[in-house]
């Protein structure tokens, strides 16, 4: 069973959203999820740090963009949000919290500021941002 | 047409210096990384230094770092590698070449401009 | 750093042969692998990227595969225009560092 859910503050236009768990989940009461992943978009702005002790708090991380198929709701995200993703100044990577490398091709990296951290924005966009700067964040949790 | 066309190469003195220009043209400079790669006559290809869009991330190669540096003027749509206390070893085609449609994360270069030959040599 | 090792050095076939170099990184790169060619006097060119992406106006006789450490570099077919050498080159970290090429020359 699927339901149209219009999120105002979260995406650009209608999501198919599945609403019973047997297609997906089990996910955090009022947390949105799509193929086997959980999201929730918080409105109240925080810096990365914050932003993934907020995520932490609740068992889930900072947004992990792995697969532009598996994840494609991504694309209608309006606004910019904290992800997981860091640059490591001393070599130039960019890496996700847990440490794993950032796949090619997933995600346009653009400069915006100087910084470490990057904010999630619509169509696979990452923006660079200072670190301590206060932004809203989107946590993900996998399901499996 | 995507474009790089090097410029300022030539024969220096040991200890001498160089300004490499590249002038770049068919797409929008500002938005990419940029580099230098260099290769000795013969030999393969080596990565010299790399400057991020907007010049917030700049790296080199160990064997040049604190002799080169590497710039960009996006107004003009060119990048510079200024080169100082030139060594033998320095001697090779000097290759511009654009970073991948990535932003910051551009791993690959493409494309490449046809090389300008810095020979060091008293 | 990241070292970068190329196999072989050397590879001397024949037009309509299946060539295959290989590519070793001394540290997990994910799929962060490009390969180039290069012929005498002029520029390398970008052949594949992302370790299997093949760039835009390349023949589909090229192909690359691989992840982590270990990747390939096939040309299906051999043509003449094809004799050249080869580098891999990572594109995870700095310093960028390249492969230490193959020539394929003709046998």
């Known amino acids: 069973i699927w339901s149209a859910v219009f999120l105002n503050s979260l995406f650009n236009q209608e999501v198919q959203i599945p609403l019973t768990e047997s297609y997906c989940g089990p996910c955090p009461k009022n947390w949105i999820c799509y193929k086997n992943n959980c999201y929730q978009f918080f409105d109240e702005s925080k810096n990365w740090y914050e932003s993934q002790a907020s995520c932490m708090s609740q068992n889930a991380s900072l947004l992990k963009v792995y697969s532009k198929e598996d994840q494609d709701l991504l694309k209608l995200v309006k606004s910019y949000h904290w992800m997981g993703l860091v640059h490591i100044p001393t070599n130039g990577s960019w890496q996700w919290e847990d440490g794993s490398i950032l796949s090619p091709n997933l995600l346009t990296i653009i400069e915006m500021q100087k910084g470490d951290c990057a904010l999630y924005a619509s169509s696979f966009k990452g923006y660079i941002e200072n670190c301590s700067t206060p932004n809203t964040y989107i946590c993900m949790q996998r399901t499996v | 047409e995507v474009q790089l066309v090097e410029s300022g190469g030539g024969l220096v003195k040991p200890g001498g210096s160089l300004r490499l220009s590249c002038a770049a043209s068919?797409?929008?400079?500002?938005?990419?990384?940029m580099n230098w790669v260099r290769q000795a006559p013969g030999k393969g290809l080596e990565w010299v230094s790399s400057i991020s869009s907007s010049s917030s991330y700049i790296y080199y190669a160990d064997s040049v770092k604190g002799r080169f540096t590497i710039s960009r003027d996006n107004a003009k749509n060119s990048l510079y590698l200024q080169m100082n206390s030139l060594r033998a070893e320095d001697t090779a085609v000097y290759y511009c070449?654009?970073?991948?449609?990535?932003?910051?994360?551009?791993?690959?270069?493409?494309?490449w401009g046809q090389g300008t030959l810095v020979t060091v040599s008293s | 750093d990241i070292q970068m090792t190329q196999s072989p050095s050397s590879v001397s076939a024949s037009v309509g042969d299946r060539v295959t170099i290989t590519c070793r990184a001394s540290q997990g790169i994910s799929s962060w692998l490009a390969w180039y060619q290069q012929k005498p006097g002029k520029a390398p060119k970008l052949l594949i990227y992302?370790?299997?992406s093949l760039q835009s106006g390349v023949p589909s006789r090229f192909s690359g595969s691989g992840s982590g450490t270990d990747f390939t570099l096939t040309i299906s077919s051999l043509q003449p225009e094809d004799f050249a050498t080869y580098y891999c080159q990572q594109g995870v970290s700095f310093p960028r560092t390249f492969g230490g090429g193959t020539k394929v020359e003709i046998k």
């Open positions: 070449a654009r970073g991948a449609p990535m932003g910051a994360a551009a791993g690959w270069f493409d494309p």
């Open positions: 992302a370790a299997s």
């Open positions: 068919g797409f929008t400079f500002s938005s990419y990384s």
